[in-house]
């Protein structure tokens, strides 16, 4: 099982935890794919982008995301860590100026145009097996995780720790 | 104040078993990551295993598969080291380690005082 | 996997001197690496994560660089209690420390 344990233990915490700097820590390229290899594509249409969730036909070349890692701190009474109570936040661009959001009325997964500070729609919790494996957790909507659903990308909410194996919000990172 | 406290080292002879234990404090235990290192007389540091936050995904260094198993007990925040068939090559200081963040793999932000294990007929 | 090689093995420097330790991946880590120090008789402690980030409470005269697969630890002004062996270790896949730099006073 892919796991984080008590989803629900944590989740009052990511509502008032707060970004420890304006910078991010590091900054990574890397394209994205689904557990079961789809690659995470994005097109643009009609001036928007677009989402898609694809097999990529031999030698076709993938999408990239930057990703930016952010710490953020726990607030001090929930995590019982103080100082050492960290976590590590996302954001993802595809391209310049364009940022993954939540829609959480819609639970959707959006590209939208925006300038910094970003705002919390576009923060995900990073919870990972390694560096190429990994889930991202709305910041605005603990227990909420991007999922895959009909070949798009998805809000899946996520209500016990259990249910964290599901491989529909599980993603690979890779460089190439 | 985070502390852990890793028991259980000794010496023991080849082909035995032993098993390690670290008991954690001063944080939440469940949130994080947990790992055991190991550092051979006047040698460097080896990763040994890891274990994420509710013990579904355990990772091992090849020369320990099928002979050490990683668990823990977040009831008890508490993580063992199950080492079985032991071999010479296995003498050394076994190190507990925590997660540098919640929820994530990476980094390991804060270190047992380690506890020694000889393996010797 | 990938190796991680730390050079030198040994570095021998007089207090206040700017000290360079270098450690090179067998393949991008994507600055996914840090750095740690162990004491004679101590565990090791964590001074530098993701490359670049300063661990809280560690002295700014250590300093970490790089990217792909060359990256380095600085100590602007050596000071006597920096007196350890250092050792890199890359998280980008899997889990890998490298053999470490011991630093010493001249």
């Known amino acids: 099982a892919f796991g984080i344990s008590g989803v629900q233990k944590y989740t009052r915490a990511l509502h008032d935890s707060s970004i420890t700097g304006i910078s991010p820590i590091t900054e990574y390229l890397a394209s994205l794919s689904t557990y079961n290899d789809q690659s995470i594509t994005f097109a643009l249409e009609d001036e928007s982008y677009e989402i898609y969730v694809e097999d990529l036909k031999k030698d076709e070349k993938k999408d990239k995301v930057l990703l930016s890692y952010y710490e953020s701190q726990h607030p001090s009474n929930e995590s019982g860590d103080g100082v050492d109570g960290k976590m590590l936040m996302v954001t993802l661009s595809p391209t310049k100026d364009f940022w993954l959001h939540a829609n959480n009325k819609e639970h959707s997964v959006e590209l939208h145009k925006c300038e910094k500070p970003l705002p919390d729609q576009a923060f995900f919790v990073l919870h990972n097996m390694h560096s190429n494996c990994v889930s991202f957790e709305c910041k605005t909507d603990p227990g909420v995780f991007i999922g895959v659903k009909d070949n798009h990308l998805a809000l899946i909410k996520v209500d016990s720790s259990e249910n964290l194996c599901t491989e529909n919000i599980l993603f690979k990172l890779s460089e190439t | 104040e985070v502390q852990l406290v890793e028991t259980g080292g000794g010496l023991v002879q080849p082909g035995r078993s032993l098993k390690l234990s670290c008991v954690a404090s001063g944080f939440t235990f469940s949130n994080y990551w947990m790992y055991w290192i190991r550092q051979a007389p006047g040698m460097g540091l080896e990763w040994v295993s890891s274990?994420?936050?509710?013990?579904?995904?355990?990772y091992y260094l090849d020369s320990v598969k099928g002979r050490f198993t990683i668990s823990r007990n977040n009831a008890e925040n508490t993580v063992y080291l199950q080492m079985n068939s032991l071999r010479s090559e296995d003498t050394a200081t076994y190190y507990c380690?925590?997660?540098?963040?919640?929820?994530?793999?990476?980094?390991?932000?804060?270190w047992g005082q380690g506890t020694l294990v000889t393996v010797s007929s | 996997d990938i190796q991680m090689t730390q050079s030198p093995s040994v570095l021998s420097a007089s207090v206040g001197d700017r000290v360079t330790l270098s450690c090179k991946a067998s393949h991008n880590i994507n600055k996914h690496l840090d750095w740690y120090q162990q004491k004679v008789g101590e565990a090791p402690k964590l001074l530098i994560y993701f490359t670049n980030n300063l661990q809280t409470g560690i002295p700014s005269r250590f300093s970490g660089s790089g990217s792909g697969t060359d990256y380095t630890l600085t100590i602007s002004s050596l000071q006597p209690e920096d007196v350890a062996t250092y050792f890199c270790?890359?998280?980008?896949?899997?889990?890998?420390f490298g053999q470490g730099t011991k630093v010493e006073i001249k």
């Open positions: 270790f890359q998280y980008n896949s899997g889990w890998t």
């Open positions: 380690a925590k997660g540098h963040y919640s929820y994530s793999s990476y980094s390991f932000g804060y």
């Open positions: 274990i994420n936050n509710d013990g579904g995904n355990t």
